[in-house]
Interface confidence: medium
Amino acid sequence: APISSHCRLDKSNFQQPYITNRTFMLAKEASLADNNTDVRLIGEKLFHGVSMSERCYLMKQVLNFTLEEVLFPQSDRFQPYMQEVVPFLARLSNRLSTCHIEGDDLHIQRNVQKLKDTVKKLGESGEIKAIGELDLLFMSLRNACI
């Protein structure tokens, strides 16, 4: 399997009750506006064929896409949570900037591309769904990167 390097986040990033709560509240607000409950972005299909040792790298890709293609364009919505959560997630992204995989990551890119395609296909409702799954993104980063 490909070897991942520098794919680690300090536990302290996930031990801040205030920002944890704000992240989950943002997800809740967005999920209330999400009518498409049959589609799941962060779930079994995203993780399929990706070992746990590669999972942090996978979640880094999802985090970067979510920030650049979803949260930044939607930054005026879901206040006051958005203005607090986006900088927090951006810091996590920055701390994972040196997280790379040595070897073939095609299987990971394929899974991430499916997520991206789903969000794009759904348009604005796809972006809302991605924000509504920030709790899963947060938990998956915690699970994979510590």
Epitope: N21, F24, K28, L46, R55, D135, N143
Partner: antibody, heavy 121, light 110 residues
């Protein structure tokens, strides 16, 4: 076939210690978060503790925090629960449980049959 | 984290539909889509029948369905069968990284 087999239960006096083990087979152990869940005789389920794939995050119910320690040895496909300062209310059948899919340990899709812990003087 | 609230018992006749409720708080059921349901027959280990509010594991009958509204999650069993008689537990993952279970509901098929 996924199999989880618990061991290490028994009768212990209040204040005593026990170490439970869970031997896992039939799946790639280090791809999954794992949990311990207990059930007192005739009572409901109570989550005790959970650990992520590499032991980096360990979470506990308030009722056992500071007394119990969860750990895992991925080379041995084993999960452990070290229980110290045991109390009568810790008496229960202790189940080892695996997440249904590897991204979410809290969806406990596979369970062992349990090992009985009795705390009594 | 307090236990989630479920009715102690429900009953129904074969072929009927029944619903079991699971009421939590804004810190668990109300906030996150991490609700699971388990079926437990006497002397057996629990079995996952619903996860992430409304997803069914492979092999679980489509007679079982889950939903959530506000702080309350629900499990509906349609076309009740004798083998559905069991204890049912809901659970929710929380923002404190813990899992909380409901007290359990005994389903009797009349």
């Amino acid at each position: 076939e996924v199999q989880l087999v618990e061991s290490g239960g028994g009768v212990v006096r209040p204040g005593g210690s026990l170490r439970l083990s869970c031997a896992a087979s039939g799946f790639t152990f280090d791809d999954y978060g794992m949990n311990w869940v207990r059930q007192a005789p005739g009572k409901g389920l109570e989550w005790v503790s959970g650990v992520n794939w590499n032991g980096g995050t360990r979470d506990y119910a308030a009722s056992v925090k500071g007394r119990f320690t969860i750990s895992r040895d991925n080379a041995k496909n084993s999960l452990y629960l070290q229980m110290n300062s045991l109390r009568a209310e810790d008496t229960a059948l202790y189940h080892c449980a695996r997440g249904w899919y590897s991204g979410a340990a809290w969806n406990m899709g596979y369970w062992g049959r349990g090992t009985l812990v009795t705390v009594s003087s | 984290q307090a236990a989630l609230t479920q009715p102690a018992s429900v009953s129904g006749s074969p072929g009927q539909s029944i619903t079991i409720s699971c009421t939590g708080a804004s810190g668990d059921v109300g906030a996150y889509n991490f609700v699971s349901w388990y079926q437990q027959h006497p002397g057996k280990a629990p079995k996952l029948i619903i996860y992430d509010v409304n997803k069914r594991p492979s092999g679980v009958s489509n007679r079982f369905s889950g939903s959530k509204s506000g702080n309350t999650a629900s499990l509906t069993i349609s076309g009740l069968q004798a083998e559905d008689e069991a204890d049912y537990y809901c659970s929710s993952y929380t923002s404190t990284f813990s899992v909380v279970f409901g007290g359990g509901t005994k389903l009797t098929v009349l």
